[in-house]
Interface confidence: medium
């Protein structure tokens, strides 16, 4: 599991691999702060509720964020 509260940042290891948006239950973006100097993106998968840390610099992940925000803006009135 790439998550730990024992370090300053939540994510220990990050994935560069793309994520199918249909597999996502939730996408959490934690901004950089005094506790962790980098942006962290945590994906909760529908299957087994497994959590994965995604690389914010990966083009595939940037595209995913775009797709998710586009979907959200469609839903909001």
């Amino acid at each position: 599991v790439p998550l730990s509260r024992t370090v300053r940042c939540t994510c220990i290891s990050i994935s560069n691999q793309p994520v199918n948006p249909r597999s996502l239950e939730k996408l959490e973006i934690i901004p950089a702060s005094q506790f962790c100097p980098r942006v962290e993106i945590i994906a909760t998968m529908k299957k087994k509720g497994e959590k994965r840390c995604l690389n914010p610099e990966s083009k595939a992940i940037k595209n995913l964020l775009k797709a998710v925000s586009k979907e959200r803006s469609k839903r909001s009135p």
């Epitope: 691999q17 793309p18 497994e50 994965r52 610099e57 990966s58 083009k59 595939a60 595209n63």
Partner: antibody
Framework: EVQLVQSGAEVKKPGATVKISCKVS????????MHWVRQAPGKGLKWMGW????????TYADDFKGRFTFTLDTSTSTAYMELSSLRSEDTAVYYC????????????WGQGTTVTVSS | DIQMTQSPSSLSASVGDRVTITCKAS??????IAWYQQKPGKAPKLLIH???TLQPGIPSRFSGSGSGRDYTFTISSLQPEDIATYYC?????????FGQGTKLEIK
């Protein structure tokens, strides 16, 4: 040295099933997603889809949904592509290709596996 | 899906010639294009990614340029060993698409 080594050529009858393997070496298998590409005789390259090597989740291109199955054996660092209900138009060379996920292009390819479907 | 229109489909040139192949995307692909060389019976070989970044070990006679929807691949001085089929690949989104290919022959 990073290598993707595919299984040998196959000759199958229509309606049969074929399973191609792609064994990787020289890098950590689960660090990169694996993609599959088809090339029919005398034709161009067609992207078939990919499998996330961390989760095992496959994604298929529209033209390759239904009869195609991508799987993994992480213990042997091997990706598989299975094709069922073979037809003559499935005759092609099938390539596995490592995706350089941080940017998304295919940087290393297998040597290709020729599948011939003939009665 | 993004379509990639590659031209010409074939071309004949002499050793030493400057050769240009183009790929036009159906929408802006943000410079996410790669170029591959494929010789008969062999797997494609990556030459260039992100429009113009040459892979290590690839001769400098190969180059790429472009932006938006229009991209160009150039061989500045054609060598006999460059005889092959060349493909562009767009990887701007997770539905990858190749151009139709350009078969390059020596005059």
């Amino acid at each position: 040295e990073v290598q993707l080594v595919q299984s040998g050529a196959e000759v199958k009858k229509p309606g049969a099933t074929v399973k191609i393997s792609c064994k990787v070496s020289g890098y950590t298998f689960t660090d990169y997603s694996m993609h599959w590409v088809r090339q029919a005789p005398g034709k161009g390259l067609k992207w078939m889809g990919w499998i996330n090597t961390e989760t095992g989740e496959p994604t298929y291109a529209d033209d390759f949904k239904g009869r195609f199955t991508f799987t993994l054996d992480t213990s042997t660092s091997t990706a598989y592509m299975e094709l069922s209900s073979l037809r003559s138009e499935d005759t092609a060379v099938y390539y596995c290709a490592r995706n350089y996920d941080y940017d998304g292009y295919f940087d290393v390819w297998g040597q290709g596996t020729t599948v011939t479907v003939s009665s | 899906d993004i379509q990639m229109t590659q031209s010409p489909s074939s071309l004949s040139a002499s050793v030493g010639d400057r050769v240009t192949i183009t790929c036009k995307a159906s929408q802006d692909i943000n410079k996410y294009i790669a170029w591959y060389q494929q010789k008969p019976g062999k797997a494609p070989k990556l030459l260039i990614h992100y429009t113009s970044t040459l892979q290590p070990g690839i001769p400098s006679r190969f180059s790429g340029s472009g932006s938006g929807r229009d991209y160009t691949f150039t061989i500045s001085s054609l060598q006999p060993e460059d005889i092959a089929t060349y493909y562009c690949l767009q990887y701007d989104n997770l539905l990858f698409t190749f151009g139709q290919g350009t078969k390059l022959e020596i005059k």
